[in-house]
Amino acid sequence: KSSNEATNITPKHNMKAFLDELKAENIKKFLYNFTQIPHLAGTEQNFQLAKQIQSQWKEFGLDSVELAHYDVLLSYPNKTHPNYISIINEDGNEIFNTSLFEPPPPGYENVSDIVPPFSAFSPQGMPEGDLVYVNYARTEDFFKLERDMKINCSGKIVIARYGKVFRGNKVKNAQLAGAKGVILYSDPADYFAPGVKSYPDGWNLPGGGVQRGNILNLNGAGDPLTPGYPANEYAYRRGIAEAVGLPSIPVHPIGYYDAQKLLEKMGGSAPPDSSWRGSLKVPYNVGPGFTGNFSTQKVKMHIHSTNEVTRIYNVIGTLRGAVEPDRYVILGGHRDSWVFGGIDPQSGAAVVHEIVRSFGTLKKEGWRPRRTILFASWDAEEFGLLGSTEWAEENSRLLQERGVAYINADSSIEGNYTLRVDCTPLMYSLVHNLTKELKSPDEGFEGKSLYESWTKKSPSPEFSGMPRISKLGSGNDFEVFFQRLGIASGRARYTKNWETNKFSGYPLYHSVYETYELVEKFYDPMFKYHLTVAQVRGGMVFELANSIVLPFDCRDYAVVLRKYADKIYSISMKHPQEMKTYSVSFDSLFSAVKNFTEIASKFSERLQDFDKSNPIVLRMMNDQLMFLERAFIDPLGLPDRPFYRHVIYAPSSHNKYAGESFPGIYDALFDIESKVDPSKAWGEVKRQIYVAAFTVQAAAETLSEVA
């Protein structure tokens, strides 16, 4: 069948019909429904929500909706033995204790099963010792502490402020520095925007608010006990000592009221510069230990959380494609939340729900997409992207052969300033073209396109007249699809003004105060930004599933490959003498990029000219486009990170949230001047250049004429 036979709505009308069916009021209603009680992964409440979503997706008209369950390692506080931190005096008496829970927001005082703030997967322990303040606990912060300030964290409890990097990286860095415990806190400098009131009177973090979150270093492994394979009924599970990515020292999060009590007594070295000072009225001394009068006092952690194998449930909905049912476009976002999930994830889940409803409406009118669309409500994202990863592990053979694209749908908003998109370069043109067709919801841009407001507010640093599109990193459910399987991926949400708001994420992230009211009162009362995000996410899915020729432009990959090659070369050229000594050359990489550019250009010309009515040739060309992302996968993975297999992009080794380009070369060059064996270190740089050059060349050849 041709694609026109797959529908009784004219092709031009298809997208408009789909977009017109999306309603802000429905998203609002769904968000309310999803946020009235907590939906923590592994709980009965979240299982019930999975069944509700399954039922509603069936009602909306999907062909099938199934639950996919897995038994994975999760982590919970001990209900009878709470976690807390103390200041103890020389006699061991607790003279100060941190709070055991967040004061509940108005209207939620009687809600049960609000999990108290904890760091998921922290081991149990009661370490006591002197405190060292380590700023954000980034790699560079520990370099400054150890190299410039000569502060040894070995045997110390470190206190780090949230922000800048993924919390798991903070814990890993602290472990490597020899710390015996980690306290994480939210500093007002990062989580309290000036001129805004704290919740419930505004969207800022109150002093008793605390950010929950997992502290794993999974590097894409999924369930810590079954890396590489699904955690199904017959799974072989590793012992806890062999589990992937678990922290080895106790970790606990606190709010800034409690942090003040710990930090105000700090002695030792002054902060190295003002970037180490937050907004509390404390000196931000680094330590170790407390100042003069309090020098005999210590800090003690009391952590009693347990790791438990627990059942989780994904909801997988299918809308079968009429022409190419064996080609999958996936829209997925998670359902589990730390507490109410007002923003994370339910502002995303509500958008997915409305997108499913709109697609279902079209299907009931007789329309089908050209390709199959899979919709997913993932479980246990907050515990390490577990639901999505286990499902992808279980279905990896299908996905690597049939996966066209994955669009992620976590939080729809983290602000209300402008659009934010991270995606594969293959999707740049799709995103540009789509946003040019959508109306901007922004004040002052009435009657203007989304592309125009987005470009004005978030301009590309390289290309004038174009918006910024960022690299994919990780920290969300696209990870397994993109970084492991090489399926073209993208994500979109509304964000804050990064120029004026320097706080990390949004202030109430992962706190009890992330409620429906937070969104409805302060972020998006008209749900117009949610609707825009629904249009972007849904529009991308629609085009990916329905375009006769896949809306991928391989020339955009050529452009970024050159940019990334230039960038990594300039990093290496900071060591000109060593490059000469060890004969380090980037010629092979630049040559491969040049070849890729030429072949991509020729492929694009053929794409314009070929006979689209010939289904075999059409399928062949589309397969070359689909498999291009796959061609950047190295089956051996990156060094020490076997599940990060994409050679062009990986999550930064220093911040899971950030994407790094040519990560193999980047990591080989990182801090190379401090390596004990320079010959070996530069040898690894050369090997990584070789791997990158080969991969780019091999990917280019997949775009060559097949015979």
Epitope: K150, G268, S269, A270, P272, D273, S275, R277
Partner: antibody
Framework: EVQLVQSGAEVKKPGESLKISCKGS????????IGWVRQMPGKGLEWMGI????????RYSPSFQGQVTISADKSISTAYLQWSSLKASDTAMYYC??????????????WGQGTLVTVSS | QSVLTQPPSVSGAPGQRVTISCTGS?????????VHWYQQLPGTAPKLLIY???NRPSGVPDRFSGSKSGTSASLAITGLQAEDEADYYC???????????FGTGTKVTVL
């Protein structure tokens, strides 16, 4: 009492080598950075470089990199500043100074009395 | 050549207030590094006067005070006394040089 005692004045000819010293006492010598500062006749202070005797980590001002060598012998709590080939323009008063703590970014709270180096043919 | 600029000289009558400015850049004072001040009496080694922008070591009279804003810092001497006649130097870490820099120095004269 915390103090830094520097070696005596030196008169040298151009091309000669020289090593001046700075002995610390009254504190844990290995736990504090020691910096060197030059003051040419009638001129201001110039930061030359710094050493952490605990691990011999040494940092130089770009202006002095390759011109002088800073070292320390922790067994005798002494820091050194040396030249392999003096020039007339090296004529100056040289001060050693201890940082206030183990941090490179701390101020210098204890200073030596200075060593006058005169280079003349 | 110093990257911290001070006025070559300031003067004041006994009892007066004088201030010395220290202007840096985005790689030193403006980067958030602390500013320290030293006093050098004629023929002696420098002495720490102010550390961490505004802190006085014990023994330094409270007539001396320091402040910092943006890419500049200043030292104020109130109730100027004859024994304050000396050279004064500011100091800050500079990230572009990976080391410390001193100011050009200011001679304070008590009239």
């Amino acid at each position: 009492e915390v103090q830094l005692v520097q070696s005596g004045a030196e008169v040298k000819k151009p091309g000669e080598s020289l090593k001046i010293s700075c002995k610390g006492s009254g504190y844990s010598f290995t736990s504090y950075w020691i910096g060197w500062v030059r003051q040419m006749p009638g001129k201001g202070l110039e930061w030359m470089g710094i050493i952490y005797p605990g691990d011999s980590d040494t940092r130089y001002s770009p202006s002095f990199q390759g011109q002088v060598t800073i070292s320390a012998d922790k067994s005798i709590s002494t820091a050194y500043l040396q030249w392999s080939s003096l020039k007339a323009s090296d004529t100056a008063m040289y001060y050693c100074a201890r940082s206030m703590g183990s941090s490179l970014y701390a101020s210098s709270d204890v200073w030596g009395q200075g060593t006058l180096v005169t280079v003349s043919s | 050549q110093s990257v911290l600029t001070q006025p070559p000289s300031v003067s004041g009558a006994p009892g007066q207030r004088v201030t010395i400015s220290c202007t840096g850049s985005s790689s030193n004072i403006g980067a958030g590094y602390d500013v320290h001040w030293y006093q050098q009496l004629p023929g002696t080694a420098p002495k720490l006067l102010i550390y961490g922008n505004s802190n006085r070591p014990s023994g330094v009279p409270d007539r001396f005070s320091g402040s910092k804003s943006g890419t500049s810092a200043s030292l104020a001497i109130t109730g100027l006394q004859a024994e304050d006649e000396a050279d004064y130097y500011c100091q800050s870490y500079d990230s572009s040089l990976s080391g410390y820099v001193f100011g050009t120095g200011t001679k304070v004269t008590v009239l």
